[in-house]
C-alpha cells in the first residue's frame, strides 16, 4: 500500500464529508460552475457556484502574468463568457548549456529584457550567437542545446604573433581583412572616429584593420552593438581616451588611465575612484551630482566616476580656477 498510489478516487477536502462526485448536480439556470483557469493560472474568488452576471478574476502563479482580458462572466445559460487569456512566464529560466560554456550573469531566473552572454575558454569562441535576450518565456535567438565552443581561428592563425597578426615565416605580419577573415569570429561593437559612427564588426576584421594602423577604430564591447548603458559608456570612454597617458593593449581592447586589464578575462575593467593614484597632469574641473561647488579631479577619477554612471559635469579641462 502506498499513500501516493492513485486509484482514481476523487479528492475530499479536509473539512468536507462528501467526495466531489457525490455533490448534487447544479441546475444551469441557477448559475455557473467553477470555470477552468488557463495553464499556470488560478481563480482568485474561488467557489463552487457563481451567480448569473458574476465575474471571476483569473490570476497567475508567481513568475507568470496575465495576457488578455482576465475576467470571466457567468451567463444565464450556465456558461462563461471568456476572452482569450493566458498566463505567460515573466521570467526565463537559466538555459542548460554545455559545461564548456560560461553564462554571464549567472542567475537562476532572468527578467524580460535581461540578456546573457555565453563565453568560451581562452582560444575558443562560441560556435554561434553569444548574446541572448529573455523575451517572455524564452530566449531570443533560441539557444540550441548542441551549442558548443570551437577553436578560435584567430588564435590558430596568429601563432606567436599578436591579435590581428599572422605568422609569415619567422615574422609577424598584419592579417588581411579580406583574405584572412572569411571564417566565423565573434561580433564586436566598434566605433569609427572618422565617420563618428558605431557598428558591429567580426573580431577578425576589426583586429586586422587595427593592425593595418587604422587608429580611428575603437573597441566598444564584445557582442553586437545594442543601445544601452554599455554602448553609451563605450562612446564616452572613446572621447576621454584621447587624453589618457596610459594605453595598454588588452585582448581586443586598450586600457586607459582609469582601467586595469583583467589577466583572467583580457578585458579592461574600470577602477573604483579610491583606486586612482593622484599622479598625472590630466586634470579636469567638474561639478559633482547636484552640488554647486567645483572640484579638480584627475583623468583617472573622472573616468571611474563616469564609468560608475555617477552624475558629473565636466566644466573644463585643467584645474578649477577658484
Amino acid at each position: 500500500f502506498s499513500i501516493m498510489e492513485n486509484n482514481g478516487q476523487p479528492c475530499i477536502n479536509d473539512d468536507e464529508e462528501m467526495k466531489e462526485v457525490d455533490l448534487p448536480e447544479i441546475e444551469a439556470d441557477s448559475g455557473c460552475p467553477q470555470p477552468v483557469p488557463p495553464e499556470n493560472g488560478f481563480i482568485r474568488n474561488e467557489k463552487q457556484l457563481y451567480l448569473v452576471g458574476e465575474d471571476v478574476e483569473i490570476s497567475c502563479l508567481t513568475g507568470f502574468e496575465t495576457v488578455g482580458y482576465q475576467y470571466f462572466r457567468c451567463l444565464p445559460d450556465g456558461t462563461w463568457r471568456q476572452g482569450d487569456v493566458e498566463c505567460q512566464r515573466t521570467e526565463c529560466i537559466k538555459p542548460v548549456v554545455q559545461e564548456v560554456l560560461t553564462i554571464t550573469p549567472f542567475q537562476r531566473l532572468y527578467r524580460i529584457g535581461e540578456s546573457i552572454e555565453l563565453t568560451c575558454p581562452k582560444g575558443f569562441v562560441v560556435a554561434g550567437p553569444s548574446r541572448y535576450t529573455c523575451q517572455g518565456n524564452s530566449w531570443t535567438p533560441p539557444i540550441s542545446n548542441s551549442l558548443t565552443c570551437e577553436k578560435d581561428t584567430l588564435t590558430k592563425l596568429k601563432g606567436h604573433c599578436q591579435l590581428g597578426q599572422k605568422q609569415s615565416g619567422s615574422e609577424c605580419i598584419c592579417m588581411s581583412p579580406e583574405e584572412d577573415c572569411s571564417h566565423h569570429s565573434e561580433d564586436l561593437c566598434v566605433f569609427d572616429t572618422d565617420s563618428n559612427d558605431y557598428f558591429t564588426s567580426p573580431a577578425c576584421k576589426f583586429l586586422a584593420e587595427k593592425c593595418l594602423n587604422n587608429q580611428q577604430l575603437h573597441f566598444l564591447h564584445i557582442g553586437s552593438c545594442q543601445d544601452g548603458r554599455q554602448l553609451e559608456w563605450g562612446l564616452e570612454r572613446t572621447r576621454l581616451s584621447s587624453n589618457s597617458t596610459k594605453k595598454e593593449s588588452c585582448g581586443y581592447d586598450t586600457c586607459y588611465d582609469w582601467e586595469k586589464c583583467s589577466a583572467s578575462t583580457s578585458k579592461c575593467v574600470c577602477l573604483l575612484p579610491p583606486q586612482c593614484f593622484k599622479g598625472g597632469n590630466q586634470l579636469y574641473c567638474v561639478k559633482m551630482g547636484s552640488s554647486t561647488s567645483e572640484k579638480t579631479l584627475n583623468i583617472c577619477e573622472v573616468g571611474t566616476i563616469r564609468c560608475a554612471n555617477r552624475k558629473m559635469e565636466i566644466l573644463h579641462p585643467g584645474k578649477c580656477l577658484a
Epitope: 554571464t104 550573469p105 542567475q107 564591447h221 544601452g228 548603458r229 554599455q230 559608456w233 586595469k260 583583467s262 583572467s264 578575462t265 578585458k267 575593467v269 574600470c270 577602477l271 573604483l272 575612484p273 579610491p274 583606486q275 586612482c276 593614484f277 593622484k278 599622479g279 572640484k295 564609468c307 560608475a308 554612471n309
Partner: antibody, heavy 118, light 112 residues
Framework: EVQLVESGGGLVQPGGSLKLSCAAS????????MAWVRQGPGKGLEWVAT????????YYRESVKGRFTISRDNAKNSLYLQMDSLRAEDTAVYYC???????????WGHGTLVTVSS | DVVLTQTPLTLSVTPGQPVSISCRSS???????????LYWYLQKPGQSPQLLIY???DLGSGVPNRFSGSGSGTDFTLKISRVEAEDVGVYYC?????????FGAGTRLELK
C-alpha cells in the same frame, strides 16, 4: 615596503570619544585615498570610512555618519579617525587600509582594538 | 545593503585536498557596463586580512596559483586546488559593486 601602523585604541564608556591614528610609510602617502575597516569580536569585516588624497572628500557608512570623522595630515603621513558618541556596537579591531589598482583594501595595518563598555 | 552569504561556515580538510567556498550575493554584482567587483580575502590566525583574488578571478600579487576564483552575477566560488597548512584561516568575500562595500561573514578553514 608599505607599512601601516594603527594606534589610539582602548577602553571607553558608551557616549565617550576616542581618536585613532595610522602612521603610513613605504609609499607616497599624499598620492592615495585611505580607509578604515573594522572587525567586531567574532564578527566579520565592515568598511567604516574613506578619504581622498587631500581630505576634501570623505565617505562614511550610514551607522557612523555624524559620529565619526576621518581626516589626514599629509605632512605627517598620518590618517585619523575621530570617534564620538561611541556605542557598544562600535567595539571592534579598527584597521587602516590602502588601495591599489588590484583592490580597494590591498594593504592593511595590524589593527587597534576599541572596546566600548560601561 | 548587499548581503553576501558564504557557505560553508567551517571547512575541515586534509592537506593536499581540494576545497571550494561559495559566496552568494543578495543582488547581482554585475554593473551596467559589465564589471563585477568581487574580491576574496584570507585572514590568517592573529593577522590582518590579505588579498587573494580581485575582480572575481584575477590572482592578487604574490598569491600562489593553487587559488582561483570564478562566478558571475550572484554566485561566486573560491577554489583551492590542494590545501596547504599555511592556508588555514578565515576566508571572506567582499563586494564593491554597490555602496556600501560589504563583506561575507567568513568561512573558517581548518586542517583535519
Amino acid at each position: 615596503e608599505v607599512q601601516l601602523v594603527e594606534s589610539g585604541g582602548g577602553l571607553v564608556q558608551p557616549g565617550g570619544s576616542l581618536k585613532l591614528s595610522c602612521a603610513a610609510s613605504g609609499f607616497t602617502f599624499r598620492d592615495y585615498y585611505m580607509a578604515w575597516v573594522r572587525q567586531g569580536p567574532g564578527k566579520g569585516l565592515e568598511w567604516v570610512a574613506t578619504i581622498n588624497y587631500d581630505g576634501s572628500s570623505t565617505y562614511y557608512r550610514e551607522s557612523v555618519k555624524g559620529r565619526f570623522t576621518i581626516s589626514r595630515d599629509n605632512a605627517k603621513n598620518s590618517l585619523y579617525l575621530q570617534m564620538d558618541s561611541l556605542r557598544a556596537e562600535d567595539t571592534a579591531v579598527y584597521y587602516c587600509a590602502r588601495p591599489s589598482t588590484e583592490a580597494l583594501f590591498a594593504y592593511w595595518g595590524h589593527g587597534t582594538l576599541v572596546t566600548v563598555s560601561s | 545593503d548587499v548581503v553576501l552569504t558564504q557557505t560553508p561556515l567551517t571547512l575541515s580538510v586534509t592537506p593536499g585536498q581540494p576545497v571550494s567556498i561559495s559566496c552568494r550575493s543578495s543582488q547581482s554584482l554585475l554593473n551596467d557596463v559589465g564589471n563585477t567587483y568581487l574580491y576574496w580575502y584570507l585572514q590568517k590566525p592573529g593577522q590582518s586580512p590579505q588579498l587573494l583574488i580581485y575582480l572575481v578571478s584575477d590572482l592578487g600579487s604574490g598569491v600562489p596559483n593553487r587559488f582561483s576564483g570564478s562566478g558571475s552575477g550572484t554566485d561566486f566560488t573560491l577554489k583551492i586546488s590542494r590545501v596547504e597548512a599555511e592556508d588555514v584561516g578565515v576566508y571572506y568575500c567582499m563586494q564593491a559593486s554597490h555602496a556600501p562595500y560589504t563583506f561575507g561573514a567568513g568561512t573558517r578553514l581548518e586542517l583535519k
